[in-house]
């Protein structure tokens, strides 16, 4: 079952290492792939003393962790390199960091974890 799926045909492209990698620095990347596979956009960046440094943006291959994500949001707490992916054309144009801590559920039957 797939709800409200948005096709991704192009993504914002950026490569901070463009000279070494011999690519464009910025632009729009068409996303290619097998017809039976989904496509996504992604962004990776670093936070150096409060200053955002984009590492890469572009197309991302079919990845179930990117399904149903219309916005590019990194939710991991304090990653070394920030990463987000999303579905929809140019959805990686804007990206954000919204850390979500683990939710611990109180339980009436405490379980002793296996060693």
């Amino acid at each position: 079952a797939i709800l409200g799926r948005s096709e991704t045909q192009e993504c914002l492209f950026f490569n901070a290492n463009w000279e070494k990698d011999r690519t464009n620095q910025t632009g729009v990347e068409p996303c290619y792939g097998d017809k039976d596979k989904r496509r996504h956009c992604f962004a990776t960046w670093k936070n150096i003393s409060g200053s955002i440094e984009i590492v890469k943006q572009g197309c991302w291959l079919d990845d179930i962790n990117c399904y149903d994500r219309t916005d590019c949001v990194e939710k991991k707490d304090s990653p070394e390199v920030y990463f987000c992916c999303c579905e929809g054309n140019m959805c990686n144009e804007k990206f954000s960091y919204f850390p979500q801590m683990e939710v611990t559920q109180p339980t009436s039957n405490p379980v002793t974890p296996k060693p």
């Epitope: 079952a1 709800l3 596979k37 989904r38 079919d62 179930i64 399904y67 994500r69």
Partner: antibody
Framework: EVQLLESGGGLVQPGGSLRLSCAAS????????MSWVRQAPGKGLEWVSG????????YYTDSVKGRFTVSRDNSRNTLYLQMNSLRAEDTAVYYC???????????WGQGTLVTVSS | QTVVTQEPSFSVSPGGTVTLTCGFN?????????PSWYQQTPGQAPRTLIY???TRSSGVPDRFSGSILGNKAALTITGAQADDESDYYC??????????FGGGTKLTVLG
């Protein structure tokens, strides 16, 4: 520490139903897709079902389509597998697995045994 | 229907090198299938060894390496040890939420 703890397995008659649960801890459950994988006695691993981060997209191997339903409760950090119309060939250890980016299974539970027999 | 194939069994001498392969019936395995490898000993849950073709999971010794060899994914174990005797499974992500496991390879470390 990431932990996945399956429960709900047991002995059931052919045609019966079971609901498996997988309690997750040690990571932000709602940020990751999850999957169920099973292993029949003496056989190899078989992917059964997967579910996206929101639960909006669900996927199944052909042999369980229409009989099994995967779901998740992100507020309870729990993954479920509702198994109906069970058959002898569904007898297996059922593992839940966390899916990381690049769509691989980075953590596994210890498994719960489902036996379908009359 | 996609079938992922692995060698059913393999033997290696202690200290030797072995390469297990993973192919499928509908074409060549490429990095876009995110090949991953798992080790399982009897009665235990699988352990993740390699993901995304060639990235070692944390805590996995560098004796284990992944690659694409020709049209197959490959797992190479160099300097095999007695405790490498296990079942090894490859998995391909076919896209659109579907994974397919190989049948597994039973690795025997001789001696």
């Amino acid at each position: 520490e990431v932990q996945l703890l399956e429960s709900g397995g047991g002995l059931v008659q052919p045609g019966g139903s079971l609901r498996l649960s997988c309690a997750a801890s040690g990571f932000t459950f709602r940020n990751y897709a999850m999957s169920w994988v099973r292993q029949a006695p003496g056989k190899g691993l078989e992917w059964v079902s997967g579910i996206s981060v929101t639960g909006g997209s669900t996927y199944y191997t052909d042999s369980v389509k229409g009989r099994f339903t995967v779901s998740r409760d992100n507020s309870r950090n729990t993954l479920y597998l509702q198994m109906n119309s069970l058959r002898a060939e569904d007898t297996a250890v059922y593992y839940c697995a966390k899916v990381y980016y690049s769509s691989f299974f980075d953590y596994w539970g210890q498994g719960t045994l489902v036996t379908v027999s009359s | 229907q996609t079938v992922v194939t692995q060698e059913p069994s393999f033997s290696v001498s202690p200290g030797g090198t072995v390469t297990l392969t993973c192919g499928f019936n509908s074409g060549s395995v490429s990095t876009s299938y995110y090949p991953s490898w798992y080790q399982q000993t009897p009665g235990q849950a699988p352990r993740t060894l390699i993901y995304n073709t060639n990235t070692r999971s944390s805590g996995v010794p560098d004796r284990f390496s992944g690659s694409i060899l020709g049209n197959k994914a490959a797992l190479t174990i160099t300097g095999a040890q007695a405790d490498d005797e296990s079942d090894y499974y490859c998995v391909l992500y076919m896209g659109s939420g579907i994974w397919v496991f190989g049948g597994g390879t039973k690795l025997t470390v001789l001696g």
